[in-house]
Interface confidence: low
């Protein structure tokens, strides 16, 4: 691959733990300023596979609050507004990075952690297993 | 709120940038070992609001590869397998944390960044604006 020349203004990396331990600036840069203004806030209610959102809080994690989606039904909502059990509501999951305080209660020392969160739900055709 | 006592084994925080700059251990701890083994990988094809996945790569970001969902249709797939334009396929978006090398090309210095990613799609009833 291409070797990118190292920036001469980089912090010193002679730490014995390098490259496992790095410096991270927590002043978050938000690249989402130009996102589509169409409101996605009510999809959880308008979806044919609606979901509820539950607060997951952990003061030892950054960010400390994450909202988890739980599908309301096993089936999906049909045109009549009833639950159709020939279809399935399933959670769409994503692995996300969070920072975990390590050692615990330390204000300036973290470990990178991967957690799986449910972001919302979608309606899928079930997999039918035919018995011979 | 509750004040959690500081761990005496914490790294020194007398840095002039504290608490903006923290130490992060990049040895990722994966908490997803007990997740449901039922693979969600085929939901993108089986959904009534199917989507394609596009690779977004950036060597200055950690993780460097992120997969973005793009809904295949404006409408949703009905029971006959046709696109029903009385319903809408919409992306479910989530803000995620990534690490951005800062200054650029530095191996051990990062800034926390928030980006908006589309994780999958769901089928929603459209908002109809009635004209008087």
């Amino acid at each position: 691959g291409i070797t990118i020349p190292r920036n001469p203004g980089c912090p010193n990396s002679e730490d014995k733990n390098f490259p496992r331990t790095v410096m991270v600036n927590l002043n978050i840069h938000n690249r989402n300023t130009n996102t589509n203004p169409k409101r996605s806030s009510d999809y959880y209610n308008r979806s044919t596979s609606p979901w509820n959102l539950h607060r997951n809080e952990d003061p030892e994690r950054y960010p400390s609050v994450i909202w988890e989606a739980k599908c309301r039904h096993l089936g999906c909502i049909n045109a009549d507004g009833n639950v159709d059990y020939h279809m399935n509501s399933v959670p769409i999951q994503q692995e996300i990075l969070v920072l975990r305080r390590e050692p615990p209660h330390c204000p300036n020392s973290f470990r990178l952690e991967k957690i799986l969160v449910s972001v919302g739900c979608t309606c899928v055709t079930p997999i039918v297993h035919h018995v011979a | 709120g509750i004040t959690i006592p500081r761990n005496p084994g914490c790294p020194n925080s007398e840095d002039k940038n504290f608490p903006r700059t923290v130490m992060v251990n990049l040895n990722i701890h994966n908490r997803n070992t007990n997740t449901n083994p039922k693979r969600s990988s085929d939901y993108y094809n089986r959904s009534t609001s199917p989507w394609n996945l596009h690779r977004n790569e950036d060597p200055e970001r950690y993780p460097s590869v992120i997969w973005e969902a793009k809904c295949r249709h404006l409408g949703c797939i009905n029971a006959d397998g046709n696109v029903d334009y009385h319903m809408n396929s919409v992306p479910i978006q989530q803000e995620i944390l990534v690490l951005r090398r800062e200054p650029p090309h530095c191996p051990n210095s990062f800034r926390l960044e928030k980006i908006l990613v589309s994780v999958g799609c769901t089928c929603v009833t459209p908002i109809v604006h009635h004209v008087a």
């Epitope: 996605s40 999809y43 959880y44 960010p63 609050v65 909202w67 972001v119 | 479910i92 989530q94 908006l116």
Partner: nanobody
């Protein structure tokens, strides 16, 4: 650092009124759509109302239309929710939220203020 601090909750009898406030800091308040959302005991999150950046448009969930009024004071970086004709089913922790309420990943939530409607 973004901070949202809700206040004004409490115990009220059915049919009564409360006015919730949210004090915002750490961001340009006037640039963002703002929301009130609530979570009833043991239930999921429910969007209640939202208001555009300049206060020109308001949106409400059907169950509160005609009873709740959302407003904002950009000069004071404050968001309000006037709740009238309160019902037992309005009992919940009320949160104010900044910008889109989805994605719901970041700490742009206060601790909330508990509203209990009971006789």
């Amino acid at each position: 650092e973004v901070q949202l601090v809700e206040s004004g909750g409490g115990l009220v009898q059915p049919g009564g009124s409360l006015r919730l406030s949210c004090a915002a800091s750490g961001f340009t308040f006037s640039s963002y759509r703002m929301y009130w959302v609530r979570q009833a005991p043991g239930k999921g999150l429910e969007w209640v109302a939202s208001i555009e950046q300049d206060g020109s448009e308001e949106y409400y969930v059907d169950s509160v239309k005609g009873r709740f009024t959302i407003s904002r004071d950009n000069a004071k970086k404050s968001l309000f929710l006037q709740m009238n004709s309160l019902r037992a089913e309005d009992t919940a922790v009320y949160y104010c939220a900044k910008g889109e309420i989805l994605p719901l990943y970041f700490d742009y939530w206060g601790q909330g203020t508990l509203v209990t409607v009971s006789s």
